[in-house]
């Protein structure tokens, strides 16, 4: 019969014959022969292959280096890589999460719109009229100005985006 020029899914062409690819978690040790199937063997500890493959070497699991602020979020298996994330208060510098940086704080006049996660930085927003933030923080939102009226007081000093209003007693008309 004519040697094949293309093979089925999960097969590869070598020496004019179709051999089965190795399943995820296993590496290629020897191609198939006319007598035997492809010889595949499991990846070792701390190694993985995540696709049907003909790789002769497994990939090393990613190392989550604590010196770079990294920790293991999900331990790798023979079929999956280790997933790293950052220590509390830090976030990844890239999608691959190869290193971490400290979460950004929102300066006075700005509040936290979205708290940082292990993979995203703090998102700040300017405090709109009626709100303020007087601290540099990675957690604090803009706070609403104090309502003097509800306390039966009057505004003595207007608020800004960085300061609250100052309330004081209402002036009493003297007889």
């Amino acid at each position: 019969p004519e040697p094949p020029t293309a093979c089925r899914e999960k097969q590869y062409l070598i020496n004019s014959q179709c051999c089965s690819l190795c399943q995820p978690g296993q590496k290629l040790v020897s191609d198939c022969t006319e007598f035997t199937e492809t010889e595949c063997l499991p990846c070792g500890e701390s190694e993985f292959l995540d696709t049907w493959n003909r790789e002769t070497h497994c990939h090393q699991h990613k190392y989550c280096d604590p010196n770079l602020g990294l920790r293991v979020q999900q331990k790798g298996t023979s079929e999956t890589d280790t997933i790293c994330t950052c220590e509390e208060g830090w976030h990844c510098t890239s999608e691959a999460c190869e290193s971490c940086v400290l979460h950004r704080s929102c300066s006075p006049g700005f509040g936290v719109k979205q708290i940082a996660t292990g993979v995203s930085d703090t998102i700040c927003e300017p405090c709109p009229v009626g709100f303020f933030s007087n601290v540099s923080s990675a957690f604090e939102k803009c706070h609403p100005w104090t309502s003097c009226e509800t306390k039966d007081l009057v505004v003595q000093q207007a608020g800004t985006n960085k300061t609250d209003v100052v309330c004081g007693p209402q002036d009493r008309l003297r007889a």
Partner: antibody
Framework: EVQLEESGGGLVQPGGSLRLSCAAS????????MCWVRQAPGKGLEWVAC?????????YYASWAKGRFTISKDTSKTTLYLQMNSLRAEDTAVYFC?????????WGQGTLVTVSS | DIVMTQSPSSLSASVGDRVTITCQAS??????LSWYQQKPGQAPKLLIY???TLASGVPSRFSGSGSGTDFTLTISSLQPEDFATYYC?????????????FGQGTKVVIK
């Protein structure tokens, strides 16, 4: 045709050295692990050493072969080698090369090594 | 190294007999067990791999079973061309080393 052919055997004195070769043909040498297995006259099969598939040189040896025997390959020549040093009378055997690591699907016909004074 | 203990070392049988050869590994080798047939002056021939997978072209009268440390080769009805020596071979791998081991062989002779 897919085949393996050993050469380099012969008579050697105790303490001497010998390098065996195994020429592979008809298959992709780079994607196949290769091993050496020996058989003393009238005795059983004995695993000697293996070399992994691929470009990085990962080798495995029977505990008795470590230090005296070295397996290597030249992918461009599709040839497997076994360097044998400090040979002893008990190393007298037919040496086979075989394709595979956890199983041996293809064997050469073997080359006879005789260690004698 | 992995040590494979094969028994019996020889057996006499007649054509048509059912023959069983056993092999024991010194430690668990999962299913990485192969069987070979060797005739005088020839290289071994792979019969069975991964405990029970028949190599292409091997007659179905040959079968293998077992797992872990204990394995069996069975020839259901011995044929004249089956008189030969049979070897088991185990493969063991850990994070630190790889080892192959052969059994001592079983010579099947005509009764």
């Amino acid at each position: 045709e897919v085949q393996l052919e050993e050469s380099g055997g012969g008579l050697v004195q105790p303490g001497g050295s010998l390098r065996l070769s195994c020429a592979a043909s008809g298959f992709d040498f780079s994607t196949n692990a290769m091993c050496w297995v020996r058989q003393a006259p009238g005795k059983g099969l004995e695993w000697v050493a293996c070399i992994a598939a691929g470009s990085s040189i990962i080798t495995y040896y029977a505990s008795w072969a470590k230090g005296r025997f070295t397996i290597s390959k030249d992918t461009s020549k599709t040839t497997l080698y076994l360097q044998m040093n400090s040979l002893r009378a008990e190393d007298t055997a037919v040496y086979f090369c075989a394709r595979g690591l956890s199983r041996f699907a293809l064997w050469g016909q073997g080359t006879l090594v005789t260690v004698s004074s | 190294d992995i040590v494979m203990t094969q028994s019996p070392s020889s057996l006499s049988a007649s054509v048509g007999d059912r023959v069983t050869i056993t092999c024991q590994a010194s430690q668990s080798i999962s299913s990485y067990l192969s069987w070979y047939q060797q005739k005088p002056g020839q290289a071994p021939k792979l019969l069975i791999y991964l405990t029970s997978t028949l190599a292409s072209g091997v007659p179905s009268r040959f079968s293998g079973s077992g797992s872990g440390t204990d394995f069996t080769l069975t020839i259901s009805s011995l044929q004249p061309e089956d008189f030969a020596t049979y070897y088991c071979q185990g493969y063991y791998s850990s994070s630190s080393y790889v080892s192959n081991g052969f059994g001592q062989g079983t010579k099947v002779v005509i009764k």
